[in-house]
Interface confidence: medium
């Protein structure tokens, strides 16, 4: 990995082992305030494998609403608006970084974790083996 | 929102005005250990809009590597394996909260930061507007 | 006509192995994903284990995680299911079962062929 | 203890319409799609819905899925004598790494 020198303003620290405890400033700062407007807007509805949305909350957990994708259906959507069984519409997935407070109920106290999200879906050709 | 009593046994914190400073624990708990055997594999081949991933490093940042999806195509493959261009690839977008490090090159100081990336790419019919 | 025939089931000691297979016929094996799921004595169904089509990627229970080994044999069609270190609470029907979907899927076209099973009991 | 909870039994007389409630969570049925199995006593189960609502060929109309959330549901409308069996629902659990199976619920057939 690449060192960086330690900046000398930086808060004390008591304790330098990992697993480490660290300061986090909570206010989030926001790089995509003029982000590309065409995000994932109603892709979920114009696409060939279209999603639905639906709403994950856990009061535990920061950030507590999480949209999650799940696939219309098990084909993708032909150019006559007909499902095609030969293709298939899979979640695309991704693990991101959540906060969970810890101990529980916890306003000022949290502990990283991973977890799994399915953001949209995409059409793929299936695996498929022909007996010669 | 959902109220919750505050456990007793919380760490003092003296700051209770928001944006507020917390203490994050960065062992990662990982909630995926056995996920999905389907997840996003050989997708990016596999998709009728396929795409690249691209290694996007910061040391400022936790995670330091992020992987970027680019849509390999403007149109989307057909069933002839050719690029249609009467359909777009486009990518799927998603807000993560990465933990910058505030001040710079502090081990234990971090602002919590939102960031757009793109996971992967889905095929869309455009949007045409037709003169009446 | 699709099927699937399990074998090598039978009566044995707490702590010692058994090997049960599963032979496939009238579907192209080795485009399927498998699974093993079994039955205790009047009771529910409980998935054991499941394999890839390519038998790259396998998933356990936690019940018998670092005890039973799934794998496959593409070339004879063939599916199998290692147990070792065997327990009473081990004791049931054990079916092998088809993915309904060829490809990378393990369950979401439900699992849509099953063999008749075959009995193991785990007995001093 | 099954993650995936069913009511341990269900009961219609022939003709009525009985409905079979399947209760996960986020890393089951919130974020995949739910399997229906029927057992009839003394032999293999046999795949009746998967998708959510997706009948495989032979299926009768009767049966019927349905999800929301993280529950799902089966249907059986113009219940029938040969509908006397176990049923099951299934799908896969993040969490856990694997697919997991519903505690099961006995369909009987009055009168």
């Known amino acids: 990995g690449i060192t960086i020198p330690r900046n000398p303003g930086c808060p004390n620290s008591e304790d330098k082992n990992f697993p480490r405890t660290v300061m986090v400033n909570l206010n989030i700062h926001n790089r995509n305030t003029n982000t590309n407007p065409k995000r994932s807007s109603d892709y979920y509805n114009r696409s060939t494998s279209p999603w639905n949305l639906h709403r994950n909350e856990d009061p535990e957990r920061y950030p507590s609403v999480i949209w999650e994708a799940k696939c219309r259906h098990l084909g993708c959507i032909n150019a006559d608006g007909n499902v095609d069984y030969h293709m298939n519409s899979v979640p695309i997935q991704q693990e991101i970084l959540v906060l969970r407070r810890e101990p529980p109920h916890c306003p000022n106290s949290f502990r990283l974790e991973k977890i799994l999200v399915s953001v949209g879906c995409t059409c793929v050709t299936p695996i498929v083996h022909h007996v010669a | 929102g959902i109220t919750i009593p505050r456990n007793p046994g919380c760490p003092n914190s003296e700051d209770k005005n928001f944006p507020r400073t917390v203490m994050v624990n960065l062992n990662i708990h990982n909630r995926n250990t056995n996920t999905n055997p389907k997840r996003s594999s050989d997708y990016y081949n596999r998709s009728t809009s396929p795409w690249n991933l691209h290694r996007n490093e910061d040391p400022e940042r936790y995670p330091s590597v992020i992987w970027e999806a680019k849509c390999r195509h403007l149109g989307c493959i057909n069933a002839d394996g050719n690029v249609d261009y009467h359909m777009n690839s486009v990518p799927i977008q998603q807000e993560i909260l990465v933990l910058r490090r505030e001040p710079p090159h502090c081990p234990n100081s971090f602002r919590l930061e939102k960031i757009l990336v793109s996971v992967g790419c889905t095929c869309v019919t455009p949007i045409v507007h037709h003169v009446a | 006509e699709v099927q699937l025939l399990e074998s090598g089931g039978g009566v044995v000691q707490p702590g010692r192995s058994l090997r049960l297979s599963c032979a496939a016929s009238?579907?192209?094996?080795?485009?399927?994903?498998m699974h093993w799921v079994r039955q205790a004595p009047g009771k529910g169904l409980e998935w054991v284990a499941v394999i890839s089509y390519d038998g790259s990627n396998k998933y356990y229970a936690d019940s018998v995680k670092g005890r039973f080994t799934i794998s496959r044999d593409n070339s004879k069609n063939t599916l199998y299911l290692e147990m070792n270190s065997l327990r009473p609470e081990d004791t049931a029907v054990y079916y092998c079962?088809?993915?309904?979907?060829?490809?990378?899927?393990?369950?979401?076209?439900?699992?849509?062929?099953w063999g008749q099973g075959t009995t193991v009991t785990v007995s001093s | 203890q099954s993650v995936l909870t069913q009511p341990p039994s269900a009961s219609g007389t022939p003709g009525q319409t009985v409905s079979i409630s399947c209760s996960g969570r986020q890393s089951n049925i919130g974020r995949h799609y739910v399997d229906w199995y029927q057992q009839v006593p003394g032999a293999a189960p046999k795949l009746l819905m998967y998708y959510d609502s997706i009948r495989p060929s032979g299926v009768p109309d009767r049966f019927s899925g349905s999800q929301s959330g993280t529950s799902a549901s089966l249907a059986i409308s113009g219940l029938q004598s040969e509908d006397e069996a176990d049923y099951y629902c299934?799908?896969?659990?993040?969490?856990?790494?694997?697919?997991?199976f519903g505690s099961g619920t006995k369909v009987t057939v009055l009168g």
């Open positions: 009238g579907f192209i094996f080795s485009n399927y994903g």
């Open positions: 299934a799908t896969w659990d993040d969490s856990l790494g694997g697919y997991v």
């Open positions: 079962a088809k993915v309904g979907a060829s490809g990378d899927y393990y369950y979401s076209y439900g699992l849509d062929v």
